[in-house]
Interface confidence: low
């Protein structure tokens, strides 16, 4: 049923009225306003921005706007004792030092409080030793080094290039390999697109540009000192030694000019293959240590950053629902940035601001959504998704009972090629239907729908004539809502052409050069892509909050469950002998998926023809839809990852950014051939199949007729 059938809606106040109110010019103006100074989490500047947003959301017409503060562990460089890396000679003299800051972009030379590049939460330390180049520091890179090349990283400082996987996974892998320090750098192969100039003349990374970022392995814990509970006034805090997810070895990021100086002297083993070579004019030797004449020189890190409990502020705005005020649809994105935040996060925050303004305009004209909409400006996302996680921990009982959906709103763009959507399968049909109603902003698709340009440029690998929609992983503020609480979630942004631009993220990500001008000059001068993203995010929120029957299709979950079961079975079948020896069977899982498919199909039939005028029956059916995502939550969580509780999806154990399906089974099977005790390892596979099969069956039963 269409949105404008909802109670208290005049024909004027339908989805079209909401979308028509969204203006590209406003998004541009808001982006400019949010990017003139740094808004680092825990700083006075970011507190002032929180209060400004609170004030403006009130003016826009929300019913209430509150600040929610928490005292969480953050990390900052020491202002009087800068971090850097040296090459030292045999006498211990520093013969080369990396730069202490990025050269500021034009027009920003006099801006104060630009935090120098650092790896947030690095411990202090001054390790020195031989260098080992570890490619991207992925699990498979260390397998290559240790198993194939017999290179031991123990006691070495490793240098890894950014890209492919979350930096925290790189650090964890280096720690497990015994390294005593990690240097992260941006290689032009990953952060310099051919044929494009460096900033300020283009959107590429200059040699002095550096990617900041946290290096935690929180696995969904939130504040490292208060896992599972909000970091409020009466919180019990762990000691720093017991804190969750902190790295144990010093880590520091550098740009490719400085990396060149370290890598050009590398000796030892040659790179194993071309996939280990970047684009610098260096041999990409693995090491350990420097070559020939330089063999007595070592690398020394000087890291003096400190971890400090600091106050952060979320802004939470409420637009009360007219019919179901106890059902929450949440739109949230973060406000804190590493420096100016031109793309991350303010291109997203500006879109949220305009969405709030449009909803507020409708509300001032007498309209209300059917369900309550919550708007959130999260703090400290860059330090480990802390603001969103602490708020969700504080409100978990309300959220698990009342949370309908969460739509994430970080960076609106990471390119200007086509749409990118990651979401729960429950939202596939919502996204498809919405994008068919929106105009494409793409050149060559004038007068065509967004669905058409998106499908053409990013086709689904499985279903012809449909666009690609990816699994949710992590690395953003939806994590606690989806992976921990089981609230249906989605995210949308404009992205690059992954076929032709194989660099990781966008080149200026988390650097000082991520400015308003970067967006206005090079990515989206007309702000038409921002407007399209506002329409997608806002349109999803509108439908979720306003449609009489929730716009979730449980049959799409059935389809992906079968696909994921097939995939994990095929992985297991790489070990047919062991499956036979240890009596490993996937029958229970396939049976549960079959049952889910049948029950979902029957539920969908009932959904077509029940009496929507009966509020009790309507609420009952909607609750079955709302709680379906919740049914995939295992209260015990995944092994060693208690805050990742979704049985169907979790962030990959090897890359936080990526989603993995049936993660419990996947992790149990991973590298199983090298396990010392195969009986125990295959026993764990069987246990994980059991958990997955039970969960799918239990979820199916929530869709059965209630009596």
């Amino acid at each position: 049923k269409s949105s404008n059938e909802a109670t208290n809606i005049t024909p004027k106040h339908n989805m079209k009225a909401f979308l028509d109110e969204l203006k590209a010019e406003n998004i541009k103006k808001f982006l400019y306003n949010f990017t003139q100074i740094p808004h680092l989490a825990g700083t006075e500047q970011n507190f002032q921005l929180a209060k400004q947003i609170q004030s403006q959301w009130k003016e826009f017409g929300l019913d209430s706007v509150e600040l929610a503060h928490y005292d969480v562990l953050l990390s900052y460089p020491n202002k009087t004792h800068p971090n850097y890396i040296s090459i030292i000679n045999e006498d211990g003299n520093e013969i080369f030092n990396t730069s202490l800051f990025e050269p500021p972009p034009p027009g920003y030379e006099n801006v104060s409080d630009i935090v120098p590049p650092f790896s947030a939460f690095s411990p202090q330390g001054m390790p020195e030793g031989d260098l080992v180049y570890v490619n991207y520091a992925r699990t498979e890179d260390f397998f290559k080094l240790e198993r194939d090349m017999k290179i031991n990283c123990s006691g070495k400082i490793v240098i890894a290039r950014y890209g492919k996987v979350f930096r925290g996974n790189k650090v964890k892998n280096a720690q497990l390999a015994g390294a005593k320090g990690v240097i992260l750098y941006s290689d032009p192969a990953d952060y310099f697109a051919p044929g494009v100039k460096s900033y300020p003349d283009g959107w590429n990374l200059p040699g002095g540009g550096v990617q900041r970022g946290n290096i935690l392995n929180l696995n969904g814990a939130g504040d490292p000192l208060t896992p599972g509970y909000p970091a409020n006034e009466y919180a019990y805090r762990r000691g720093i030694a017991e804190a969750v997810g902190l790295p144990s070895i010093p880590v520091h990021p550098i740009g490719y000019y400085d990396a060149q100086k370290l890598l050009e002297k590398m000796g030892g083993s040659a790179p194993p293959d071309s996939s280990w070579r970047g684009s610098l004019k260096v041999p990409y030797n693995v090491g350990p240590g420097f070559t020939g004449n330089f063999s007595t020189q070592k690398v020394k890190m000087h890291i003096h950053s400190t971890n400090e409990v600091t106050r952060i502020y979320n802004v939470i705005g409420t637009l009360r629902g007219a019919v179901e005020p106890d059902r929450y649809v949440i739109l949230g994105g973060h406000r804190d940035s590493w420096v100016f935040g031109g793309i991350d996060p303010q291109s997203g925050a500006a879109v949220v601001h305009e969405i709030v303004r449009s909803f507020g305009t409708l509300k001032k004209e007498g309209w209300r959504p059917r369900r309550t909409i919550l708007f959130a400006s999260w703090d400290a996302e860059e330090f480990g998704l802390l603001g969103s996680t602490e708020w969700a921990e504080e409100n978990s009982r309300l959220l698990q009972e009342r949370g309908v959906a969460y739509i994430n709103a970080d960076s609106s763009i990471e390119g200007n090629y086509t749409l990118r959507v990651d979401c729960t399968p429950l939202m596939y049909s919502l996204v498809h239907n919405l994008t068919k109603e929106l105009k494409s902003p793409d050149e060559g698709f004038e007068g065509k729908s967004l669905y058409e340009s998106w499908t053409k440029k990013s086709p689904s690998p499985e279903f012809s004539g449909m666009p690609r929609i990816s699994k949710l992983g992590s690395g953003n503020d939806f994590e606690v809502f989806f992976q921990r609480l089981g609230i249906a979630s989605g995210r949308a942004r404009y992205t690059k052409n992954w076929e032709t631009n194989k660099f990781s993220g966008y080149p200026l990500y988390h650097s000082v050069y991520e400015t308003y001008e970067l967006v206005e000059k090079f990515y989206d001068p007309m702000f038409k892509y921002h407007l399209t993203v506002a329409q997608v995010r806002g349109g999803m929120v509108f439908e979720l909050a306003n449609s009489i029957v929730l716009p979730f299709d449980c049959r799409d979950y059935a389809v992906v469950l079968r696909k994921y079961a097939d995939k994990i079975y095929s992985i297991s079948m790489k070990h047919p002998q062991e499956m036979k020896t240890y009596s490993v069977s996937f029958d229970s899982l396939f049976s549960a998926v079959k049952n889910f498919t049948e029950i979902a199909s029957k539920f969908s039939e009932r959904l077509q023809d029940f009496d929507k005028s009966n509020p009790i029956v309507l609420r009952m059916m909607n609750d079955q839809l709302m709680f379906l995502e919740r049914a995939f939550i295992d209260p015990l969580g995944l092994p060693d990852r208690p805050f990742y509780r979704h049985v169907i999806y979790a962030p990959s154990s090897h890359n936080k950014y990526a989603g993995e399906s049936f993660p419990g089974i996947y992790d149990a099977l991973f590298d199983i051939e090298s396990k010392v005790d195969p009986s125990k390892a295959w026993g764990e596979v069987k246990r994980q199949i059991y958990v997955a099969a039970f969960t799918v069956q239990a979820a199916a039963e929530t869709l059965s007729e209630v009596a």
Partner: antibody
């Protein structure tokens, strides 16, 4: 049935070191936290240290922090306690314990204990 | 640190008696409390976990109750094999502290 078998106890001089081991058999320990608890002669129980299932996180009583290190080797199903700078007040029977992940019970299974005597 | 105070420190009872041991925490520990039984020269044995859940193989005459700061272990009908020392322990916040013990002796 889960069985825990401690070893490595004995007589050691003050300032010396010992490494205790605890071998687990029966059931899966993949997802279980493990612990050391000690009991001085004629006294009550005192928690010493805890380690997470993957070994990523460890926790210590203030009385042993900086001197003792808990670790585990999941491939060998073995828990360890490295005890350095031993003092007379560390004299005790040391028990290793394991949680029961399936039921959520902490300190569900206990070993029979190994005696550590610190004396000159 | 959270202090756990057991009472009484010792008690004398006869076979068939109903015995109650209490344990008080110095701050709220929700339901994160275990009870153990220890016989001389033996390792402690888990009786009750998470305040009221009977551990595997423990007879049903043992029961636990409470929440927050005040907890009780009850033996509904004391048996000869129940004469031992009983400990409570909180595992809400590290350090995971034990009570000082309650010795149940034959009257």
């Amino acid at each position: 049935e889960v069985q825990l078998l401690e070893s490595g106890g004995g007589l050691v001089q003050p300032g010396g070191s010992l490494r205790l081991s605890c071998a687990a058999s029966g059931g899966y320990s993949f997802s279980d936290y493990m612990h050391w608890v000690r009991q001085a002669p004629g006294k009550g129980l005192e928690w010493v240290a805890t380690i997470s299932s993957g070994g990523s996180y460890s926790y210590y009583a203030d009385s042993v922090k900086g001197r003792f290190t808990i670790s585990r080797d999941n491939s060998k199903n073995t828990l360890y306690l490295q005890m350095n700078s031993l003092r007379a007040e560390d004299t005790a029977v040391y028990y290793c314990e394991k949680d029961n992940y399936a039921t959520g019970a902490w300190f569900a299974y206990w070993g029979q204990g190994t005696l550590v005597t610190v004396s000159s | 640190d959270i202090q756990m105070t057991q009472s009484p420190s010792s008690l004398s009872a006869s076979v068939g008696d109903r015995v109650t041991i209490t344990c008080r925490a110095s701050q709220d520990i929700r339901n994160y409390l275990n009870w153990y039984q220890q016989k001389p020269g033996k390792a402690p044995k888990l009786l009750i976990y998470y305040t009221s859940n009977l551990a595997s193989g423990v007879p049903s005459r043992f029961s636990g109750s409470g929440s927050g700061t005040d907890f009780t272990l009850t033996i509904s009908s004391l048996q000869p094999e129940d004469f031992a020392t009983y400990y409570c322990q909180q595992y809400w916040i590290g350090p995971f502290t034990f009570g000082q013990g309650t010795k149940v002796e034959i009257k």
